[in-house]
């Protein structure tokens, strides 16, 4: 019953960009201005989205589908589909409650958008800092003191074993 | 209908005042955050100041301690009282509901003025 049913629904033949129009014995009717409908057989159009304020048009909504929004220039999106709209900041800041704000010493964000985050720890891998870090970049770890020891190849051969605390001859 | 007017633009000397309005209608303004942004000539939308529904303000670095932002819940208006003007403050400043109220952050409910120019110049 309901697979006929299905096929005596007048709405069914309705394509996107229409409706069935219930206030005319269900003749299919173009989507209003300012609407659409993505899939057939739809009984109502929905509203298009408005890009306004921070939100600028990326695509022009039509009888088939929705507009799509990005941002102004300055700003990113957030969120599916661009639901929101965050400030940028400069390499080397991070959005705070007063606005953009640099990082502090030992900090980085080499983007415009984002937190600043801590600087690598070198000595956590036995490395030393090649490069120093500044508000924009991390830190270059390089390798470790022992490998730029007087002397040392380039190819390090496996270290004896040694207890702890003696340092190599 | 949703509607944001903003008001109080003008051309002022460096050193000035101004204060800009922004008349609501259309939604429960006592209980939504407003903000204020600008954009100068040339360059991008900037987040100038925020204020939640209790009173609570927060201000760009740029702007603080020159500028006050205020709401009237029984008028539904919007302030931003600007004291010490400088060149640099020469843009087109907007209201804008704030559901987000995440600084420097709008969401795509939100509903934005039309904007009201502020040109700071001796």
């Known amino acids: 019953f309901e697979r006929t049913r299905s096929l005596q629904d007048p709405c069914s033949n309705c394509p996107a960009g229409t409706f069935c129009d219930n206030n005319r014995n269900q003749i299919c009717s173009p989507c209003p201005p300012n609407s659409f409908s993505s899939a057939g057989g739809q009984r109502t159009c929905d509203i298009c989205r408005q890009c306004k304020g921070v939100f600028r048009t990326r695509k022009e909504c039509s009888s088939t589908s929705n507009a799509e929004c990005d941002c102004t220039p300055g700003f990113h999106c957030l969120g599916a589909g661009c639901s929101m709209c965050e400030q940028d900041c400069k390499q080397g800041q991070e959005l705070t409650k007063k606005g953009c704000k640099d990082c502090c010493f030992g900090t980085f964000n080499d983007q415009k958008r984002g937190i600043c985050r801590p600087w690598t720890n070198c000595s956590l891998d036995g490395k030393s800092v090649l490069v120093n870090g500044t508000k924009e970049r991390d830190v270059v770890c390089g390798p470790s003191p022992a490998d730029l020891s007087p002397g040392a190849s380039s190819v390090t051969p496996p270290a004896p074993a040694r207890e702890p605390g003696h340092s190599p001859q | 209908e949703v509607q944001l007017l903003e008001s109080g633009g003008g051309l002022v000397q460096p050193g000035g005042s101004l204060r800009l309005s922004c008349a609501a209608s259309g939604f429960t303004f006592s209980s939504s955050a407003m903000s204020w942004a600008r954009q100068a000539p040339g360059k991008e939308l900037e987040w100038v100041s925020s204020?939640?529904?209790?009173?609570?303000?927060y201000y760009v670095e740029s702007v603080k301690g020159r500028f006050t932002i205020s709401r009237d819940n029984a008028k539904n208006t919007l302030y931003l009282q600007m004291s010490s003007l400088r060149a640099e403050d020469t843009a087109v400043y907007y209201c804008?509901?704030?559901?987000?109220?995440?600084?420097?952050?709008?969401?795509?409910?939100?509903?934005w003025g039309q904007g009201t120019l502020v040109t700071v110049s001796s």
């Open positions: 804008a509901t704030w559901k987000t109220l995440r600084v420097g952050v709008w969401d795509e409910s939100d509903y």
């Open positions: 204020i939640y529904s209790s009173g609570k303000t």
